[in-house]
Amino acid sequence: YDFTNCDFEKIKAAYLSTISKDLITYMSGTKSTEFNNTVSCSNRPHCLTEIQSLTFNPTAGCASLAKEMFAMKTKAALAIWCPGYSETQINATQAMKKRRKRKVTTNKCLEQVSQLQGLWRRFNRPLLKQQ
């Protein structure tokens, strides 16, 4: 999916009002410096591409994020504010339902959510200094 035509300000508002708090709740008890940055993004569409990938694509050691509260709210925000996004996700959602497993918070998941926090911060960053 190409995130170029999303309403970035509306997505930013959704992040600031709820998604950010849900990410903090998930990470509670973890030091903010515990994980180094291992993923970045270079503009708002790119950030959403990487956020979608980390949030909804199962990875080795962390297959369970898609059912977390922050993930469901992320999915809702993208569906509302990114034209045509929900249509592209129907097949992915069906596959996810078949895969649904017991919820386990692993260290790998904590690391992944830490990276998500970093990506969201970059998405919401103010303009850099004029170089």
Epitope: N37, S42, Q131
Partner: antibody, heavy 122, light 108 residues
Framework: QMQLVESGGGVVQPGRSLRLSCAAS????????MHWVRQAPGKGLEWVAV????????HYADSVKGRFTITRDNSKNTLNLQMNSLRAEDTAVYYC???????????????WGQGTMVTVSS | SYVLTQPPSVSVAPGQTARITCGGN??????VHWYQQKPGQAPVLVVY???DRPSWIPERFSGSNSGNTATLTISRGEAGDEADYYC???????????FGGGTKLTVL
């Protein structure tokens, strides 16, 4: 653990070519801009080239433009520097480094390799 | 092209504060990054975006930037701080990275 490992350095005659490689591991390579920086013996750091996170744009220092080519392969997590028409003044330790970027602005180089020595001598 | 000017050397007594400057035309409008390099080793980022510090760098390292001068401040200097220090910016007008000439810090 995040790591950059350079290879390909060595001794080469003036006018000849050399290809350096940088293998990245421990981070999502395709999301970072990547640089080559060099340091001549006893001298300071000199920036050589940068390639965008997706390979869509490239910039070179004036001293190497037209002779050096920076490339990346995001499927293999590798960065390369093809060095042609080498000169004695290209003798240096060559480092690769990663850099987050925002739009067309490159940020700090937060991870560096250990460097590979290139000596251009007849 | 944009030029960054650093003093070749700075010395500090153990426990005292060292300040390394980096001069450039209206450098306060740019984001400045600082690197530490010890002999035979690769550079290490110590301060980025003028004053931010990577999580692995001690709080003794800090930075500031305004007008025509950026400054790296190292408080309570230690023997282990002896190294070369480089400032760096991204120059959008030329699409080039620019490094300062480097400053050798000596802890007396």
């Amino acid at each position: 653990q995040m790591q950059l490992v350079e290879s390909g350095g060595g001794v080469v005659q003036p006018g000849r070519s050399l290809r350096l490689s940088c293998a990245a591991s421990g981070f999502t390579f395709r999301t970072y801009g990547m640089h080559w920086v060099r340091q001549a013996p006893g001298k300071g750091l000199e920036w050589v080239a940068v390639v965008w996170y997706d390979g869509s744009d490239i910039h070179y220092a004036d001293s190497v433009k037209g002779r050096f080519t920076i490339t990346r392969d995001n499927s293999k997590n590798t960065l390369n520097l093809q060095m042609n028409s080498l000169r004695a003044e290209d003798t240096a330790v060559y480092y690769c480094s990663r850099s987050p970027q925002w739009e067309d602005i490159f940020e700090s180089m937060d991870i560096w390799g250990q460097g590979t020595m290139v000596t251009v001598s007849s | 092209s944009y030029v960054l000017t650093q003093p070749p050397s700075v010395s500090v007594a153990p426990g005292q504060t060292a300040r390394i400057t980096c001069g450039g035309n209206n450098i306060g409008s740019k984001s400045v990054h600082w690197y530490q390099q010890k002999p035979g080793q690769a550079p290490v980022l110590v301060v980025y975006d003028d004053s931010d510090r990577p999580s692995w760098i001690p709080e003794r390292f800090s930075g500031s930037n305004s007008g025509n001068t950026a400054t790296l401040t190292i408080s309570r200097g230690e023997a282990g701080d002896e190294a070369d220090y480089y400032c760096q910016i991204w120059d959008s007008s030329s699409d080039h990275v620019v490094f300062g000439g480097g400053t050798k810090l000596t802890v007396l």
